[in-house]
């Protein structure tokens, strides 16, 4: 830590005196203190001398010596009083700027420590301090107003009793700034606007802040609009509102509107788009494919997006068949509004049954007319398989019927032994039927195909199996020839319950 000579915490001198303050450290040292006149600074290696041969009351202050190279940042200080009978105060600042709830130091330094007992803080022109002003005094630093409030932004003077009369300092202006968390808060309503040409419209831009010093304006396509401003103060916030009223809108009023507010912390802006249309409109769309395929027993949500102006006068979901005349339950239909002119309508179809395949239509109406959007829902089924032995044109034939959706593929297997299902070790022969005959293929129904396997002689210690598979699953049927005829055996696991 540097050492100051003279080694006293305080030094009291008279105006015109010579003052020499010497600081010595291990490394280079430097003096600092309030910028004031008449000081001369001399440095010589590890010592620095601060001197004046004509001290004035303005040299009153705390002078600190630091060692810049010291990692611990040690410093030493000495306080100099230049006691001028005509000047009890050395005011180091004309203005003090602090934020609310900070301590505000009004730096009027007493030039004579003897006067400390008779000091006080007043507002200019002798006015008393505001109620609840909590302050303290230090002869080295001045008056501190604790936890300063915005309302305490005033001009202050420091007062000292000298020979029975009060001597005032020059004034210090205190500016207590509100803590502004950021740029003003903004609202621009509506967030989006659509009007038919000739209708009326209103756009409201409002900004608020804890501090009155902020600007707000509304601009249309980058042109600032001249709109009278309404100002208000409530909930401890200043509010400025700009209202644009349009009695009869036309196409030139359309475009981007931006509400912009700025203060010392920066700028905020928010925008909206105003569309002017010739007539009412109603548009239906879906992000989904209008042709849907779902496995039986699973669920599906059908979603329709509606864009409309003016608003909808009616809407509903309708089942158009072909299986029954049931209609979707209202509780399964759901509507959500994305914004003023866009809505999403959802129809929930949980645990789909075979009779629920078919066409679903969403209908909506507004002054622009009716619109409809239709979905086609086809259910997927795993294959069901059956095999029979028959003679076709005198030849023994195994006939396999497979029913499912999508259309099943058919494979025949011949394996040794009697079994419900051929495994790899038993397989003797495999036949793929690339083109089974389609027996039925109606919209929204299962597809039924038939595959024929001509067998000249049925081997009695063997099993013939028809396997069908599609994207949903697979099914099989094992045919076991028996001396007394033939035996067909569906596998145990194929008990399909939707």
């Amino acid at each position: 830590i540097p050492v100051i000579e003279p080694s006293v915490p305080e030094l009291v001198v008279k105006p015109g005196a010579t003052v020499t303050l010497r600081c010595v450290g291990n490394g280079s040292v430097e003096w600092d203190g309030p910028p004031s006149p008449h000081w001369t600074l001399y440095s010589d290696g590890s010592s620095s001398i601060l001197s004046t041969n004509n001290a004035t009351f303005q040299n009153t202050g705390t002078y600190r010596c630091t060692e810049p190279g010291d990692p611990l940042g040690g410093s030493a200080a000495i306080h100099l009083y230049v006691k001028d009978p005509a000047r009890p105060w050395n005011v180091l600042a004309q203005e003090v700027v602090v934020f609310e709830d900070q301590d505000a130091l009004l730096p009027c330094l007493l030039t004579d420590p003897v006067l400390e007992a008779g000091v006080s803080l007043v507002r200019v022109r002798g006015r008393p301090l505001m109620r609840h002003t909590n302050y303290s005094f230090s002869p080295w630093h001045g008056f501190t107003i604790h936890r300063a409030k915005f309302i305490q932004s005033q001009d202050y003077q420091c007062s000292a009793l000298m020979g029975g009369r009060k001597v005032m300092s020059i004034s210090i202006r205190l500016k207590v700034q509100k803590v502004i968390p950021g740029p003003p808060a903004l609202t621009l309503v509506p967030a989006e606007l659509v009007r038919i040409r000739g209708e009326a419209a209103q756009i409201v831009c409002s900004a608020s802040s804890v501090d009155v010093n902020f600007d707000v304006f509304l601009q249309h396509n980058n042109t600032k609009l001249a709109i009278p401003q309404q100002s208000d103060f409530h909930n401890n916030r200043y509010q400025k509102v700009l209202t644009l009223n349009l009695d009869q809108v036309d196409f030139q009023h359309a475009g981007n509107y931006s509400c912009v507010a700025s203060n010392v912390q920066g700028k905020h802006s928010t925008s909206m788009f105003f569309r002017v249309v010739e007539s009412a409109y109603l548009n239906l769309s879906s992000e989904q494919n209008l042709i849907q395929e779902v496995t039986v027993g699973e669920g599906l949500n059908l979603k329709v997006m509606v864009e409309a102006y003016p608003g909808l006068q009616g809407f509903n979901w309708t089942y158009l068949g072909p299986f029954s005349d049931h209609q979707p339950e209202p509780k399964l239909a759901n509507a959500t509004t994305k914004d003023t002119y866009r809505h999403t309508f959802t129809l929930s179809l949980p645990r789909l049954k075979p009779s629920e395949a078919g066409r679903y239509s969403f209908l909506a109406r507004n002054p622009g007319g009716w619109r409809a959007l239709t979905f086609e829902l086809t259910l997927r089924y795993p294959p069901e398989v059956s095999v029979i032995w028959t003679f076709i044109n005198g030849s023994g034939t195994l006939l396999c019927a497979a029913s499912g959706y999508p259309q099943p593929n058919v494979t025949w297997l011949q394996c040794s032994g009697h079994t419900d299902r051929c495994d790899e070790a038993q397989v003797l022969q495999v036949w793929d039927d690339p083109y089974p005959e389609v027996l039925s293929q109606e919209p929204f129904h299962k597809v039924t195909v038939q595959s024929l396997l001509t067998v000249e002689t049925l081997e009695h210690n063997q099993t013939y199996e028809c396997r069908a598979h599609n994207s949903v699953g697979s099914g099989s049927w094992a045919f076991i020839p028996i001396s007394a005829g033939a035996h067909t055996h569906p596998p145990d696991e194929f008990l399909f319950t939707p």
């Epitope: 004031s36 000081w39 004509n54 630091t66």
Partner: antibody, heavy 116, light 110 residues
Framework: QVQLQESGPGLVKPSETLSLTCTVS????????WSWIRQPAGKGLEWIGR???????NYNPSLKSRVTMSVDTSKNQFSLKVSSVIAADTAIYYC??????????WGQGSLVTVSS | QSVLTQPPSASGTPGQRFTISCSGS????????VNWYQQLPGTAPKLLIY???QRPSGVPDRFSGSKSGTSASLASSGLQSEDEADYYC???????????FGGGTKLTVL
């Protein structure tokens, strides 16, 4: 080593407020006085004012009515605002450390142009 | 109009001695010390001399300063090409309660 860095908009419209911030690194803002000095193109230096960590300020009388300085010790920053700017306020603005009236550390300067 | 008066320009050849003057009044140079700042092209000013004649560390000893009455001067014993810069004098002004600067002297090394 103490370093100072000015930041703020380079272009300000007439009648608006010029705002600059000086960030101090390599040392604490708390123990010194800090100043703003400006230099119009091709001209000399002009002292704008000074501020102490406690918020105490002194301004050049010729600019006093338009200048506000503030300090944020938590961010090691001090700032300058000049209101109602005119073309004559176009200059390079420097922040500097003021030690007993000696400006021993300077920022690199920030050019502010006042123009519509 | 600057409070302190400096010649707008000065020139010299390498190795030559140069002097820049700075004139003030009793409220500034007459009662307070003078500081000098060097501003190399395109850079910020740098402290060159403080308290009339003190050099900060890193400043070559060819630079020196002096003060007499209400005037001060900056001198260099051997001009070098890197000395080409603007030089400003400054002093505390009692009336302003702040610093005042000279208008600057542009030094050209020929």
């Amino acid at each position: 080593q103490v370093q100072l860095q000015e930041s703020g908009p380079g272009l300000v419209k007439p009648s608006e407020t010029l705002s600059l911030t000086c960030t101090v690194s390599g040392g604490s803002i708390s123990s010194y006085y800090w100043s703003w000095i400006r230099q119009p193109a091709g001209k000399g230096l002009e002292w704008i004012g000074r501020i102490y960590a406690s918020g105490g300020t002194n301004y050049n009388p010729s600019l006093k009515s338009r200048v506000t300085m503030s300090v944020d010790t938590s961010k090691n920053q001090f700032s300058l605002k000049v209101s109602s700017v005119i073309a004559a306020d176009t200059a390079i603005y420097y922040c500097a450390r003021n030690r007993l009236g000696i400006y021993d550390y300077w920022g690199q300067g920030s050019l502010v142009t006042v123009s519509s | 109009q600057s409070v302190l008066t400096q010649p707008p320009s000065a020139s010299g050849t390498p190795g030559q001695r140069f002097t820049i003057s700075c004139s003030g009044s009793s409220s500034n140079i007459g009662s307070n010390t003078v500081n000098w700042y060097q501003q190399l092209p395109g850079t910020a000013p740098k402290l060159l001399i403080y308290s009339n004649n003190q050099r900060p560390s890193g400043v070559p000893d060819r630079f020196s300063g002096s003060k007499s009455g209400t005037s001060a001067s900056l001198a260099s014993s051997g001009l070098q090409s890197e000395d080409e810069a603007d030089y400003y004098c400054a002093a505390w002004d009692d009336r302003l309660n702040g610093p005042v600067f000279g208008g600057g002297t542009k030094l050209t090394v020929l």
